[in-house]
Interface confidence: medium
Amino acid sequence: KKEDGESTAPTARPKVLRCKCHHHCPEDSVNNICSTDGYCFTMIEEDDSGTPVVTSGCLGLEGSDFQCRDTPIPHQRRSIECCTERNECNKDLHPTLPPLKDRDFVDGPIHHK
């Protein structure tokens, strides 16, 4: 996971950061650009049909530390990366799906405890 450009210096992050957004664009966004006081993110996750869908957007400063932490979710494959170093920095983020569990390659029903 990347959180490039993070710094303890208060001047390191611009007051308003512009991010590329797709499927997470607020109503007031223009040309697929949103603005935030927090982070830009790009996320890859399997949709309900197992297709690896990429979305991107803005995260507010409040709570973004937690959201940018890639905590595994049971039975869901997803990965998120965040950045703050420049406008539209999330264009260059490239999160990758965590590997499939071996049980997905065994014929027969799955039994969850």
Partner: antibody
Framework: QVQLQQPGAELVKPGASVKLSCKAS????????MHWVKQRPGRGLEWIGR????????KYNEKFKSKATLTVDKPSSTACMQLSSLTSEDSAVYYC?????????WGTGTTVTVSS | DIVMTQSQKFMSTSVGDRVSVTCKAS??????VFWYQQKPGQSPKALIY???YRYSGVPDRFTGSGSGTDFTLTISNVQSEDLADYFC?????????FGDGTKLELR
């Protein structure tokens, strides 16, 4: 190894129906959705629809809603597509394709020929 | 429906060349694009997902790029086994739609 096996060819008469099969092996059948794609020579690829083998839930391309019916048989790990009221426009190669994240596997394809 | 346009139906190349196959979406699809390779008499084979992610086992001479509406599949150091049809597909919204394909031929 993930594999999708399809019969090589089907010859059917105009107006008739045909049921195409796609047998999956090498993975847990119910965890990967199955897509169906049509290919005619010089006409590129067309997405027909997809089915969730676990629930049987389907999503169709409007264009094929009255033409194709997708089903699954879980015990045999087989997905099926029934094509109805066949015309020469339905003569094509039909592929099943299974996708899960960074795995993407296509069947061998069934050539359907509609001819009297 | 989203239309995927591959304006070049044929592209001529030589072994060792670098070639770029392009695909244009009729509306913004983010990076939700697949690239497929198809050889005569064979099923399509997935090369790239999410516009730039290479499937495992795909040689690193295949590179996908682009976002929004413009996408490119670049093959550097073309090999004779790369001569095939290449299709893009968007999966940002239903129905999923494909480009008409670009045939890569030997010059």
């Amino acid at each position: 190894q993930v594999q999708l096996q399809q019969p090589g060819a089907e010859l059917v008469k105009p107006g008739a129906s045909v049921k195409l099969s796609c047998k999956a092996s090498g993975y847990t059948f119910t965890t990967y959705w199955m897509h169906w794609v049509k290919q005619r020579p010089g006409r590129g690829l067309e997405w027909i629809g997809r089915i969730d083998p676990n629930s049987g839930g389907t999503k169709y391309n409007e264009k094929f809603k009255s033409k194709a019916t997708l089903t699954v048989d879980k015990p045999s790990s087989t997905a099926c597509m029934q094509l109805s009221s066949l015309t020469s426009e339905d003569s094509a190669v039909y592929y099943c394709a299974s996708r899960r994240g960074d795995i993407d596997v296509w069947g061998t394809g069934t050539t359907v020929t509609v001819s009297s | 429906d989203i239309v995927m346009t591959q304006s070049q139906k044929f592209m001529s190349t030589s072994v060792g060349d670098r070639v770029s196959v392009t695909c244009k979406a009729s509306q913004n699809v983010g990076t939700n694009v697949f690239w497929y390779q198809q050889k005569p008499g064979q099923s399509p084979k997935a090369l790239i997902y999410a516009a730039s992610y290479r499937y495992s086992g795909v040689p690193d001479r295949f590179t996908g790029s682009g976002s929004g509406t413009d996408f490119t599949l670049t093959i550097s150091n073309v090999q004779s086994e790369d001569l095939a049809d290449y299709f893009c597909q968007q999966y940002d919204s239903y129905p999923l739609t494909f480009g008409d394909g670009t045939k890569l031929e030997l010059r």
